[in-house]
Amino acid sequence: LQDLCSNCPAGTFCDNNRSQICSPCPPNSFSSAGGQRTCDICRQCKGVFKTRKECSSTSNAECDCISGYHCLGAECSMCEQDCKQGQELTKKGCKDCCFGTFNDQKRGICRPWTNCSLDGKSVLVNGTKERDVVCGPSPADLSPGASSATPPAPAREPGHSPQ
């Protein structure tokens, strides 16, 4: 005996109470594949979540975070509080970056300033809580009498993007 439910398209469910008729998903529910015997309840974007995309009969809702928060996890499963640049979020709330570290975003942790001397360079611009240091030419390049046929290319540490 052929299962009539396999004919039910996405956006419907196979209603056993009505001789396996394909019924539309009720409001606030969806079925993203055909042949389903129930529709799934739509995700509700409440509290710190706001609706980015409403649920349709074939796809679930998608949420964003309200102002002052940002998404974490797959499909924005959590909202985490924003901090200011120059801060990081701790269990006790937003705290300023310790000396020698910086954070140029509203999320994430404070990261250590680049150590210019490891690359044989000097500090051109000091770091702050919000910005990394800017490394310049090595001290030797700046000494009197040092000359070069071509100016040195701007150096960049591997794995570091320019600020």
């Epitope: 956006g11 539309p24 009720p26 409001p27 606030n28 739509c42 609706t51 980015r52 995309k53 409403e54 649920c55 349709s56 009969s57 074939t58 796809s59 809702a61 998608e62």
Partner: antibody
């Protein structure tokens, strides 16, 4: 800010058809349902149906299934409702409204007059 | 279709008074009820969603309660701008339906 813009009025003859428009702005058009609601003078609101612009899902009130056809033009972020075989009973204000369940933003409404 | 009955058809109150609107559903609809008001010659405006959830930008004097079949919208101190028609709407099942409305008028 979210806005739904509708023409103020339409005058059509009995037996003819009309296509009412609802231009959306201030949000991602394809992510939110558009509903159509009828209100005759001095009467209550009557839900006609809705359409999801992201994939053209539609739901209709059975009373309007042969009367109304809902479509969208994604390129212009505009929803349309085509009303056919018009009679004097179709004279009303027609609103478009955004929302999957509760309708959070409404157009100003189009006053449709069916008269010879 | 789910029938929503609003009573009374007309409510007469003075500014500053507390007022409550009733909406009764013909079957259990959980909390899938939403409230609107509509001023003369204006578009409806969402006041409360899902029976009791507040809406951004709506004054705190508006509140909602109820579940199942009986729902109430309250205004704790009516202001002049609140005199309008009030409608409930259900989103529990297709088709969505509205109540017949209650007119709030000045006593």
């Amino acid at each position: 800010q979210v806005q739904l813009q509708q023409p103020g009025a339409e005058l059509v003859k009995p037996g003819a058809s009309v296509k009412l428009s609802c231009k959306a702005s201030g949000y991602t058009f394809t992510n939110f349902w558009i509903n159509w609601v009828k209100q005759r003078p001095g009467q209550a609101l009557e839900w006609i149906g809705n359409i999801y612009p992201g994939n053209d899902n539609t739901n209709y009130n059975g009373n309007f299934k042969t009367k109304a056809t809902l479509t969208v033009d994604r390129s212009s972020s505009t929803a349309y409702m085509h009303l056919s075989s018009l009679t004097s009973k179709d004279s009303a204000v027609y609103y478009c409204a955004r929302g999957q369940l509760g309708l959070d933003y409404w157009g100003q409404g189009t006053t449709l007059t069916v008269s010879s | 279709d789910i029938l929503l009955t609003q009573s009374p058809a007309i409510l007469s109150v003075s500014p500053g008074e507390r007022v409550s609107f009733s909406c009764r559903a013909s079957q259990n609809i959980g909390t899938t009820i939403h409230w609107y008001h509509q001023r003369t010659n204006g578009s409806p405006r969402l006041l409360i969603k899902f029976a009791s959830e507040s809406i951004s930008g709506i004054p705190s004097r508006f509140s909602g309660s109820g579940s199942g079949t009986d729902f109430t919208l309250s205004i704790n101190s009516v202001e002049s701008e609140d005199f309008a028609d009030y409608y409930c709407q259900q989103s529990n099942s297709w088709p969505f339906t509205f109540g017949s409305g209650t007119k709030l008028e000045i006593k």
